[in-house]
């Protein structure tokens, strides 16, 4: 019999510090660029080494970004949301959420988790 | 993944104008940032000019502006550089290059480490 799979979604208040070479991710997505079919949500796609993403260690590859600074990202062109990031200020505060991948195995077993890429 | 095949070098006399094309395989051509870097024998690769996903923003390397230009044909899958005014000095092999999204940085898609896809390069030589 084959396991279910399930997602746990969860939110979190990410605070970053501009380092010398930025941010240090890429993204994904907006209204002129769906990643995922019928969201327009920005995604992270890419996070560099030993930049500030990957240092701070809590923005993961797939995670969809809700805001920056407080400011919504819904319904924005892909070019718009990289102005954005890219004008957010030298301290950036990202609203992400994580998708966690569950799978529920066979009653009796238990789930086993791991992030999604 | 993507894969990219330059064409279009060849050898020019000075003055003349050059089209490279470069065709990428895969479905989701038109969510890549796009870029040319160009290497001199015995010289390090360099930022030629770079595409966003869309195509609305390009950028050039100092030494191109005005005289190149980028544009790409996300229906095509397929990425171009006009070289107009050829100089000797813009021999080289060329490289088509190729990373997902957008970096949210200011000149990050000028860097080489950047991008994660290269083609094998296509010679241009001006003489």
């Known amino acids: 019999m084959n396991g279910r799979v399930d997602y746990l979604v969860t939110e979190e208040e990410i605070n970053l510090t501009r380092g010398p070479s930025g941010l240090g991710f890429n993204i994904v997505g907006g209204t002129d660029q769906q990643y995922v079919s019928n969201d327009s949500g920005i995604y992270v796609s890419r996070i560099k080494e030993n930049g500030a993403a990957a240092l701070d260690g809590r923005l993961q590859e797939g995670d969809k970004i809700l805001s920056v600074n407080g400011q919504d990202l819904k319904n924005l062109l892909h070019q718009d949301a990289v102005d954005l990031f890219r004008n957010a200020g030298y301290a950036v505060s990202l609203r992400v959420q994580h998708r966690l991948q569950v799978q529920n195995g066979p009653i009796g077993h238990r789930g086993e988790g791991d992030p999604s890429g | 993944d993507v894969q990219l095949v330059e064409s279009g070098g060849r050898l020019v006399q000075a003055g003349d104008s050059l089209k490279l094309s470069c065709a990428a395989s895969?479905?989701?051509?038109?969510?890549?940032?796009m870029g040319w870097f160009r290497q001199a024998p015995g010289k390090e690769r360099e930022f030629v000019a770079g595409?966003?996903?869309?195509?609305?923003?390009?950028n050039y390397g100092d030494s191109v502006k005005g005289r190149f230009s980028i544009s790409r044909d996300n229906a095509r899958n397929t990425m171009y550089l006009q070289m107009n005014s050829l100089k000797p000095e813009d021999t080289a092999v060329y490289f088509c290059?190729?990373?997902?999204?957008?970096?949210?940085?200011?000149?990050?898609?000028?860097?080489?480490?950047?991008?994660?896809?290269w083609g094998q390069g296509t010679q241009v030589t001006v003489s």
């Open positions: 290059a190729a990373f997902r999204g957008s970096c949210v940085d200011y000149g990050c898609d000028f860097r080489v480490s950047q991008y994660d896809y």
């Open positions: 895969g479905r989701t051509f038109s969510t890549y940032t």
């Open positions: 595409t966003s996903p869309s195509g609305d923003n390009r």
